[in-house]
């Protein structure tokens, strides 16, 4: 028996288009819309289990649903790699595996998924609401990271309900050519939508296959997911003893914000342009709690699970100090 929290991959709804063949002019907009929403967004899933036989023993499983080849997987805890976490294991498909206490066994499960078992005892053993993050570096999608944790109140042996998690990060996202095509497509889509603005909209059918409804529900409320793709970083903030922002960023704000690269290869790229989502200025942050956006100046509560968006981590020490890499 085990307790597990699954962070599923987010997928867009697949609306049925009534009379699609009769509205050929509307097929292209919907195809483009799907491309705009899904292109360049490979997904990472994270599953955290606590074994009933060893209450402080954890198994973390992570998978990458992109189509590219994985060049490196980094597993961290206490926060995302480079933003408050500590590296537990690094898995390279050719060069091997390196792990640090309390990691006991890291291994590849498939070509695109890994698992990590953590020791259950010791001063550095995890607690039940520790956040575990997996970062997949791949080509050509870039670097993607997602985080998950056990619900604080979960009992061993009970299965926690799946919780939607944002696709957390695209450091080195996509190929410029593809991005350009998609950008053109999205602009063209907007043009078409404006042309059809005053025409009756086609009636959409609910999907007839049972999996679709949950998928649509998972996507619909995922403003945080899309916002996460337009700010440099997002993490589920459920670490054991979360640091205050002052501690996590002792210099008043992420000092790496100003040094974020400006070349497109390192910019997070998301499915839709959220022009209304303000990008935080240096030293500020955006907090997403219960689907609400709050801007810098207010501190997100650190007493319970929440979603906090951070600028692109500056690196190891972001991890190392309060982070853990340095």
């Amino acid at each position: 028996m085990r307790t597990e929290a699954q962070v599923p991959a987010l997928q867009p709804p697949e609306p049925g288009l009534e009379g699609a063949m009769g509205h050929r002019t509307l097929v292209l907009p919907w195809v483009l819309l799907t491309l705009c929403v899904t292109a360049g967004t490979p997904e990472v899933w994270v599953q955290v289990r606590m074994e009933a036989t060893e209450l402080s023993s954890f198994t973390i499983r992570c998978g990458f649903l992109g189509s590219g080849s994985i060049s490196l997987v980094t597993v961290s805890w206490g926060g995302p790699n480079g933003a408050g976490g500590t590296t537990l294991a690094v898995l390279h498909p050719e060069r091997g595996i390196r792990q640090w206490a309390p990691a006991r066994q890291a291994r590849w499960e498939t070509q695109s998924s890994i698992s990590l078992i953590l020791e259950g005892s010791g001063a550095s053993s995890p607690c039940a609401n520790t956040t575990f993050c997996c970062k997949f570096a791949s080509f050509p999608e870039g670097s993607w990271e997602a985080c998950g944790s056990l619900p604080p109140s979960s009992d061993p042996g009970l299965s926690a309900p799946p919780t939607p998690a944002p696709i957390l990060r695209a450091d080195l996202a996509g190929i410029l050519g593809v991005s350009g095509v998609l950008l053109f497509g999205c602009v063209y889509l907007l043009h078409l939508l404006r042309r059809h603005k005053h025409r009756p909209a086609p009636r959409l059918q609910p999907s007839r296959t049972s999996p679709q409804a949950p998928r649509a529900r998972a996507w619909a409320p995922s403003q945080a997911s899309q916002a996460a793709l337009h700010v440099p970083y997002a993490t589920i903030n459920t670490s054991c003893r979360p640091a205050t922002l002052d501690t996590a960023h002792p210099h008043g704000g992420p000092s790496w914000w100003a040094s974020l690269p400006t070349h497109a290869a390192h910019r997070p790229q998301g499915p839709a342009a959220w022009a209304s989502t303000p990008i935080p200025a240096r030293g500020s942050f955006v907090s997403v709690e219960n689907g609400l956006y709050a801007q810098a100046g207010e501190r997100p509560p650190h007493t319970g699970p929440g979603l906090t968006l951070f600028p692109d981590p500056r690196g190891p020490r972001a991890m190392e100090g309060p982070l853990g890499v340095r």
């Epitope: 490196l72 979360p242 981590p313 190392e320 340095r326």
Partner: antibody, heavy 118, light 112 residues
Framework: QHELQQSGAELVRPGSSVKLSCKDS????????MHWVKQRPGHGLEWIGS????????EYSENFKGKATLTANTSSNTAYMELSSLISEDSAVYYC???????????WGQGTLVTVSA | DIVLTQSPASLAMSLGQRATISCRAS??????????MHWYQQKPGQPPKLLIY???NLESGIPARFSGSGSRTDFTLTINPVETDDVATYYC??????????FGGGTKLEIR
């Protein structure tokens, strides 16, 4: 074997600049930070700064801002540190070291001796 | 900046004895329930070598004679028993406060 290979010793004039290199032969280059550490003869270790490979982010100790400039060429897995306006107190062994979040500086180069002398 | 103070500055031990080196931080180096304190060994003419990471975790390939303990501001490196090969200078380092990864002043271990 994970090795960080540093460039050779440098003898330079006061006021000039020098650029040291550190090649990381291992895959960690893209997943960790490359740090630089100074050690003057008979002295302790002094952290200079770090370059984070996957985000191109640099961090500097207050003591070395304006003195050291950190860069990297990810295609060749090489990190660089340029020291400018050199003075005799800059004579030291400079180490590069890499590490993963929160786990210390796991891997070290052999060090590069820089001697500033007229 | 966090200041790390090591004591003693030098230590002369007999073979087989237990050597204890202390490192005190000017403020806590703990975060997320983890102590971001590390210990290094440096022999003359060589780069430092990581011995202990995060206060108490033995780095791969390091003999079990080395151990680390402590939390928040007070940390200890213990070598038991001391061997001839342990003659070196030992440094503590904190990595909890960005962007200053400060080192202690070092403790020189000698065999008498």
């Amino acid at each position: 074997q994970h090795e960080l290979q540093q460039s050779g010793a440098e003898l330079v004039r006061p006021g000039s600049s020098v650029k040291l290199s550190c090649k990381d032969s291992y895959f960690a280059f893209m997943a960790s930070a490359m740090h630089w550490v100074k050690q003057r003869p008979g002295h302790g270790l002094e952290w200079i700064g770090s370059f984070t490979m996957y985000s191109d982010a640099t961090e500097y100790s207050e003591n070395f801002k304006g003195k050291a400039t950190l860069t990297a060429n990810t295609s060749s897995n090489t990190a660089y540190m340029e020291l400018s306006s050199l003075i005799s107190e800059d004579s030291a062994v400079y180490y590069c070291a890499s590490g993963y979040s929160g786990n210390g500086f796991t891997y070290w180069g052999q060090g590069t001796l820089v001697t500033v002398s007229a | 900046d966090i200041v790390l103070t090591q004591s003693p500055a030098s230590l002369a031990m007999s073979l087989g004895q237990r050597a204890t080196i202390s490192c005190r931080a000017s403020e806590s180096v703990d975060n997320y329930g983890i102590s971001f304190m590390h210990w290094y060994q440096q022999k003359p003419g060589q780069p430092p070598k990581l011995l202990i990471y995060r206060a108490s975790n033995l780095e791969s390939g390091i003999p079990a004679r080395f151990s680390g303990s402590g939390s928040r501001t007070d940390f200890t490196l213990t070598i038991n028993p001391v061997e001839t090969d342990d003659v070196a200078t030992y440094y503590c380092q904190q990595s909890n406060k960005d962007p200053m990864y400060t080192f202690g002043g070092g403790t020189k271990l000698e065999i008498r």
